[in-house]
């Protein structure tokens, strides 16, 4: 079974699943659609690095640019260094800026909804 | 101003190379995907290849592989395309295109010609 | 490779009229089609993308339908700014086919 018949047979199950899942099935050539990746848990999305989204979305990244407004897109690009971004070549802007360090404050993250960010 | 600059004319002669330029100004251009175009006269238009100006990821339509060649230089915010051995073929305009579709060069219209 | 067809690939109408514009993927693009305007001697201009958005700027006598393989772009209302060329293009990887084009003339 390749990763596409594998992705339909799972596909109802995926809203509750969790990141390691979702990091797993980025390393199975899925091609997840956009309206999937929507509705998918916010916090499951958020540790994803650039890499995995566009493993695990293959040419339905194009789709991220649609839905930059949109949770879970939106938060998950406050999360992403600006640099990184730019290496999917979408426009996606909002993205740490260069030369910041981000500190991994969980409770302030959980108080302010984004990560908490030291200038250079 | 957001805008995509291309020469307006290149002649040159069959057999030769060229390389056409475009310049971006007015967004981030490490942003975006870089797209060419091309349009024969009176003709539709025809994918040639795109180049991401971060990490050098380029893809060409099978066609012109062979011929065309896709570069940025980022200090100067500017996309290239050369093609080699030039036959009447390739007179046509050439646009390049910012990736989401919105912003297009004016288009430089090469002249094969001896 | 995706092999986008289009149809018809030419159009005569008049204006105040409604007219339709059919662009077919040869196999699935979900919503990845974008549609352009080109007038003679100028570089094509974005009209809708993702199916069904309407670019920034873009009268709202456009609108684009469809998924999947069947797309189209409707303009109701002609005006004489609407006669010109209009082309379908897939953005679901590459290479990014455009459709052949349907020129759109006054009647």
């Known amino acids: 079974m390749n990763g596409s018949e594998y992705f339909v047979k799972i596909q109802s199950f995926l809203g509750g699943a969790p990141t390691e899942d979702l990091k797993a099935l980025s390393q199975q050539n899925v091609s997840m659609d956009l309206a999937t990746f929507m509705k998918l848990r916010t916090d499951a999305v958020l540790p994803l690095t650039v890499a995995e989204v566009q493993k695990l979305l293959g040419p339905h990244v194009e789709g991220l640019k649609a839905e930059e407004r949109h949770r879970p897109v939106r938060d998950w690009i406050l999360r992403q260094r600006q640099d990184d971004l730019d290496t999917l070549g979408l426009g996606l802007q909002g993205g740490i800026p260069n030369g910041y360090l981000v500190l991994d404050l969980s409770m302030q993250e959980a108080l302010s909804g984004t990560p908490c960010l030291l200038g250079p | 101003q957001v805008q995509l600059q291309q020469p307006g004319t290149e002649l040159v002669k069959p057999g030769a190379s060229v390389r056409l330029s475009c310049r971006a100004s007015g967004y981030s251009f490490s942003s975006y995907w870089m797209h060419w175009v091309k349009q024969r006269p009176g003709q539709g238009l025809e994918w040639l290849g795109n180049i991401n100006p971060t990490t050098g990821d380029i893809n060409y339509n099978e066609k012109f592989r062979n011929r065309a060649t896709l570069a940025v230089d980022k200090s100067s915010t500017t996309a290239y395309l050369q093609l080699t051995s030039l036959t009447s073929e390739d007179s046509a305009v050439y646009f390049c295109v910012r990736h989401d579709g919105f912003l297009w060069g004016q288009g430089t219209t090469l002249t094969v010609s001896s | 490779d995706i092999q986008m067809t289009q149809s018809p690939a030419s159009l005569s109408a008049s204006v105040g009229e409604t007219v339709t514009i059919t662009c077919r993927a040869s196999?699935?693009?979900?919503?990845?089609l974008a549609w352009y305007q080109q007038k003679q001697g100028k570089s094509p201009q974005l009209l809708v993308y993702y199916a069904k958005t309407l670019a920034e700027g873009v009268s709202s006598r456009f609108s684009g339908s469809g998924s999947g393989t069947q797309f189209s772009l409707k303009i109701n209302s002609l005006q004489p700014e609407d006669f010109g060329t209009y082309y379908c293009q897939h953005q679901f990887g590459t290479p990014r086919t455009f459709g052949g084009g349907t020129k759109l003339e006054i009647r």
């Open positions: 196999e699935n693009i979900y919503s990845y």
